[in-house]
């Protein structure tokens, strides 16, 4: 029975005399008067078996002690660690000439674990062992002896096992412990590659090349290799593995990404939190699922937020000129979280009697600059038929519109070609200006050309230069424009609409809001 003792991870013990419980029972020759087995205690009061010999008074000593058979376990080189005490001959009276201060270590390779008789000549000598510290009379007087430790190695070995032998030639020795071990490079993980327990090579300078295998949930980037050195240390790691998509490195392992995290590719990156408007419900996600109503375009990276189609364009304005129509609009309030917004124009030709009976306009109609994929917020439509009702739809689209097309993404206007629109309004007046509002009034156009259905007021901050305008519609010839900013210059245009369409906008009226209320009568010129 062998008790367990702790040794370095790169050493595999084949024999440890200190761990043997009960007698070692090694073979001594001669049987009497030579090596003697002695039981002593270790520091934990556990018995350990030792061998001692001290025939220093008699000449020509040749005392042999042979171990049991020791399996090699595939090792080509083994190490023998001997802890022993050795008396200094000078400390022993009357032994000059007969006392020695060394002993010899031998080995014999064998496939037979039960060899009874091995001739001395069959053993190969490993070394002569001398003490670093021999024990003088002073040591004896102190009654506490230091232990010598000597390590020798032997190899290459080829048979299944071997026997060790200790030859005493007249010394006073106690073998306190004998440990036989071989060295291995212990199982390890480097760069996410696992390298197995590897027995060191036969020579003290040899390197054993070992190919590693990627840990679970990882894949080779470059072929992982290492070299097992003779001392049981791994050397020169080459190549590596990378955690698969959906996994990240943690303590030398590839762990699945937690819920709410993802990793799209086999890289050395960590899992990332799901981008905005997306989620993962399983561990090990390689991408995150978009929230309801949100989408990811084909060319969107997994790291991009999920987005949605834009809302409808705002403030669509039409201007009919015989068989041409100019359309103008503002950007949608909500772009869906994307930059790739563009506009498509849909033209429908509708029957005069039943506006619901509409057909596509066909290829004869031309669009400037283009019909689809417009980056600007205006288009001119030409080559329309005269005296015809047209409905124009402006669709705001982005990279994910195709996943969820909806009428909510378009705005439409209906016009009739070839009817004269009203003339422009000659006079627009600012009746009252406050800090936050302007009261406007105007006259009917000189040439209404029909029944005025409504007036349209377009206004914007002067320094915005018509980039961002607002529209107010009214059937009356006056209106209060509210929600303005104090001390700000605004530009106002007004036009009339009849069944034939919109007339031209009036000349601009520039008004600056006040810091204190006052009445200002406009005369069509700039007011301040």
């Amino acid at each position: 029975v062998t008790g367990s003792r702790v040794y370095p991870a790169n050493e595999v013990t084949l024999l440890d005399s200190r761990s043997v419980q009960g007698e070692l029972g090694w073979i001594a020759s001669p049987l009497e008067g030579g090596w003697e087995e002695v039981s002593i205690m270790d520091e934990k009061n556990t018995p350990i078996r030792t061998y001692q010999v001290c025939n220093v008074m008699e000449a020509s000593q040749n005392n042999w002690l042979r171990t049991d058979w020791i399996t090699r376990e595939g090792a080509q080189r083994v190490y023998i660690e001997i802890k022993f005490t050795l008396r200094d001959c000078n400390s022993l009276p009357g032994v000059m000439g007969t006392c020695k201060e060394t002993f010899n270590l031998y080995y014999y390779e064998s496939d037979n674990d039960k060899e009874r008789f091995i001739r001395e000549s069959q053993f190969g000598k490993i070394d002569t062992i001398a003490a670093d510290e021999s024990f003088t009379q002073v040591d004896i007087g102190d009654r506490i002896m230091k232990l010598n430790t000597e390590i020798r190695d032997v190899g290459p070995l080829s048979k299944k096992g071997f026997y060790l032998a200790f030859q005493d030639v007249g010394a006073c020795i106690a073998l306190v412990s004998v440990r036989v071990f071989y060295k291995k490079c212990p199982l390890t993980v480097r760069n996410l590659a696992q390298f197995p327990d590897t027995i060191t090579g036969a020579d003290t300078s040899s390197l054993v090349e070992v190919r590693g295998s990627c840990v679970n949930n990882s894949e080779e980037k470059d072929v992982p290799k290492m070299y097992c050195g003779a001392d049981g240390e791994w050397l020169v790691p080459i190549g590596n593995c990378l955690c698969n998509a959906g996994h990240e490195e943690q303590n030398g392992e590839c762990q699945a990404c937690k819920i709410g995290y993802y990793k799209a590719l086999s890289t050395d990156a960590s899992c990332a939190k799901c981008p905005p408007h997306s989620y993962s419900v399983w561990e090990g996600a390689t991408s995150c699922t978009c929230d309801r109503g949100f989408f990811r375009a084909d060319n969107d990276a997994a790291s991009m937020p999920c987005t949605r189609p834009p809302s409808a364009p705002l403030n669509l304005i039409s201007n009919v000129n015989e068989t041409s129509v100019n359309l103008e609009w503002s950007s949608p309030q909500n772009t869906g979280g994307r930059q790739d917004i563009s506009y498509n124009v849909v033209c429908k030709k509708c029957g005069a009697g039943d506006p619901s009976k509409c057909r596509p306009c066909g290829s004869g109609v031309h669009y400037t600059p283009q019909q689809n994929g417009l980056k600007t917020t205006r288009v001119s439509i030409t080559d329309l038929l005269a005296h015809t009702n047209y409905t124009f739809e402006i669709w705001a689209v982005n990279g994910v519109s195709k996943y969820n097309p909806s009428p909510d993404q378009s705005v439409s206007v209906t016009v009739t070609t070839n009817q004269a629109a009203p003339s422009s309004i000659a006079l627009v007046q600012a009746k009252e200006v406050t800090r936050y509002s302007v009261a406007l009034a105007w006259l009917e156009p000189d040439r209404p050309n029909g029944v005025i259905l409504e007036y349209e007021v377009k206004y914007y901050e002067k320094d915005q230069n018509e980039r961002s305008y607002r529209i107010v519609r009214t059937a009356a010839r006056n209106t209060d424009i509210k929600g303005l900013n104090p001390l700000t210059s605004y530009v106002f245009h007004v036009r009339a609409r009849t069944a034939a369409g919109y007339g031209d906008f009036s000349e601009p009226l520039e008004v600056t809001t006040n810091t204190v209320p006052s009445r200002i009568i406009g005369d069509g010129a700039n007011s301040t």
Epitope: E36, E37, V38, S39, I40, M41, D42, E43, N45, I48, T50, Q52, C54, V56, K83, T85, R87, L92, F135, I140, G141, D142, R143, I144, M145, K146, L147, C172, A174, V176, S177
Partner: antibody, heavy 126, light 112 residues
Framework: EVQLVQSGAEVKKPGSSVKVSCKAS????????ISWVRQAPGQGLEWMGG????????NYAQKFQGRVTMTRDTSISTAYMELSRLRSDDTAVYYC???????????????????WGQGTMVTVSS | DVVMTQSPLSLPVTPGEPASISCRSS???????????LDWYLQKPGQSPQLLIY???NRASGVPDRFSGSGSGTDFTLKISRVEAEDVGVYYC?????????FGGGTKVEIK
């Protein structure tokens, strides 16, 4: 249970020698040290010397050097102490005592006299 | 040689009460291996001595836990937490670091 059994009382003339034996029963005799301690009537304890197997030879107190010889015969598990040139002040009870040997990873030593013989009275008188 | 000095020479005790014996050495008994090489023995009337404590503070096998040893270097103490009638006798300390081994002069413990 190890016991140390000593030889019987002795009466000796001054100048003569006495040899006291100490036989161990139980245990492995070679596995422990044997020391000899004496106690003069009404006095304290006095260490004379001993044999520690892994030290190789006997070790004697300077006071008894040249007069005392300690030996052991492992075949019969017996230790001996011989004191020569006896004087009247050698009158004492002579004890043999066992010391357990121990070794740590760096040194070896002993763990006290854990078993004692019953004592042998040696009287030196003319 | 190392000289061992014990005190007191005599210690009258009451059963159930604690008792303490001091031992001083002329040289340190602390070895470089960390052990103090000091033992305590009790010799009951008409008997051979028996080991109580070895290496300064380790109780020998079968010794009741009311006995404890302490100290390091040159000053050591044996304590009996609650003296019992069977504890009477002469207590000796002994240095086991160097030869010659040396015993203290002894402390006689007796019931009041």
């Amino acid at each position: 249970e190890v016991q140390l059994v000593q030889s019987g009382a002795e009466v000796k003339k001054p100048g003569s020698s006495v040899k006291v034996s100490c036989k161990a029963s139980g245990g492995t005799f070679s596995s422990y040290a044997i020391s000899w301690v004496r106690q003069a009537p009404g006095q304290g304890l006095e260490w004379m010397g001993g044999i520690i197997p892994i030290f190789g030879t006997a070790n004697y107190a300077q006071k008894f050097q040249g007069r005392v010889t300690m030996t052991r015969d492992t075949s019969i598990s017996t230790a001996y102490m011989e004191l020569s040139r006896l004087r009247s002040d050698d009158t004492a009870v002579y004890y043999c005592a066992r010391e357990l040997l121990y070794c740590s990873s760096t040194s070896c030593g002993t763990h006290g006299f854990d078993i004692w013989g019953q004592g042998t009275m040696v009287t030196v008188s003319s | 040689d190392v000289v061992m000095t014990q005190s007191p020479l005599s210690l009258p005790v009451t059963p159930g009460e604690p008792a303490s014996i001091s031992c001083r050495s002329s040289q340190s008994l602390l070895h470089s291996n960390g052990y103090n090489y000091l033992d305590w023995y009790l010799q009951k009337p008409g008997q051979s001595p028996q080991l109580l404590i070895y290496l300064g503070s380790n109780r020998a096998s079968g010794v009741p836990d009311r006995f404890s040893g302490s100290g390091s270097g040159t000053d050591f103490t044996l304590k009996i937490s609650r003296v019992e009638a069977e504890d009477v006798g002469v207590y000796y300390c002994m240095q086991a670091l160097q030869t010659p081994l040396a015993f203290g002069g002894g402390t006689k413990v007796e019931i009041k």
